[in-house]
Interface confidence: low
């Protein structure tokens, strides 16, 4: 019957993801029992995305590779609401790589997923970015301005934030 075939499809989809994420946390979307959205355990979810705070300290490139192994990217922040959600899970004495870099050092910032860089939706600390040799962006806490972005050298190991689309089963 219909419910049985739906369940079989779900199970095969879950097996597909199991090699990367042994455990998924799923919630029912809306009122329809057929629509479930999942994030890997222990990732957090906000709107249509899942987030993972990586506490291992790595360079920007290695951090991005680490995210991609998990089927994600370094985080792309699209709205103030999204940033407000993310910072709830961050430690004030740490810095975290974003999926934002300026590879040519010419202040052409680009997101890892090719989302257009929109000056109007950026959250740089005042006076940042301030160094052409600092080509990668972090989010960190400054007591005067709370949470914001700063440009830093890409080789300096930092924690990082990974983001992936929710898994729908």
């Amino acid at each position: 019957n219909f419910m049985y075939s739906k369940t079989v499809k779900r199970l095969s989809k879950l097996r597909e993801y199991q090699q990367y994420h042994p455990s998924l946390t799923c919630v029912m979307e809306g009122k329809d029992i057929e629509d479930w959205s999942c994030c890997p355990t222990p990732w957090t979810s906000f709107q249509s995305s899942c987030y993972f705070i990586s506490t291992g300290m790595q360079s920007w490139t290695k951090s991005q590779k680490n995210c991609s192994v998990m089927g994600a990217d370094l985080v792309v922040i699209n709205t103030r609401e999204e940033q407000d959600f993310i910072i709830q899970n961050l430690k004030r004495n740490s810095s975290y790589f974003l999926g934002l870099s300026d590879p040519g050092g010419r202040r052409h910032w680009q997101w890892v997923d090719q989302t257009p860089y929109n000056e109007n939706v950026t959250f740089w600390h005042s006076g940042e970015p301030n160094n052409l040799d600092e080509r990668c962006a972090i989010i960190n806490f400054r007591s005067s301005e709370e949470w914001g972005w700063n440009d830093i050298h890409c080789h300096v190991p930092q924690k990082s934030i990974c983001k992936m689309k929710k898994i729908y089963i």
Epitope: S59, W60, T61, K62, S101, D102, P103, G104, G105, L132, D133, R135, C136, H153, C154, H155, V156
Partner: nanobody, 125 residues
Framework: QVQLQESGGGLVQPGGSLRLSCEVS????????MAWFRQATGKEREFVAA????????VYGDSVKGRFTMTRDHPKKMVYLQMDNLKPEDTAVYYC??????????????????WGQGTQVTVSS
Amino acid sequence: QVQLQESGGGLVQPGGSLRLSCEVSTDTFSSLAMAWFRQATGKEREFVAAISWSGASTVYGDSVKGRFTMTRDHPKKMVYLQMDNLKPEDTAVYYCAGDLDGRTWHGDDLEYDYWGQGTQVTVSS
């Protein structure tokens, strides 16, 4: 095609100095982050120094800090490693490396796209 050619290696006594050069043949030299690595016989490749695309920023491996200086000359498309107060443990083949996106100048050899053939440095009395 990016080609890197090291020179300047040789035999030197402990406490002596050497200057290694790396000639880079590419039109995109000014956007390359550059680095020096070394590999002693039977050991893993070790990070020595790196310099950002503009030359404004450098970073050094712990074992060479205060003794080695890395610079670059944009018009000549050259990178240099001035090595002073050399020690026997500095004996190794020294490699020049370049990273095309200029983003990842640091001590991880996996990040570098282009490599020279190496030049031997021997520190011995």
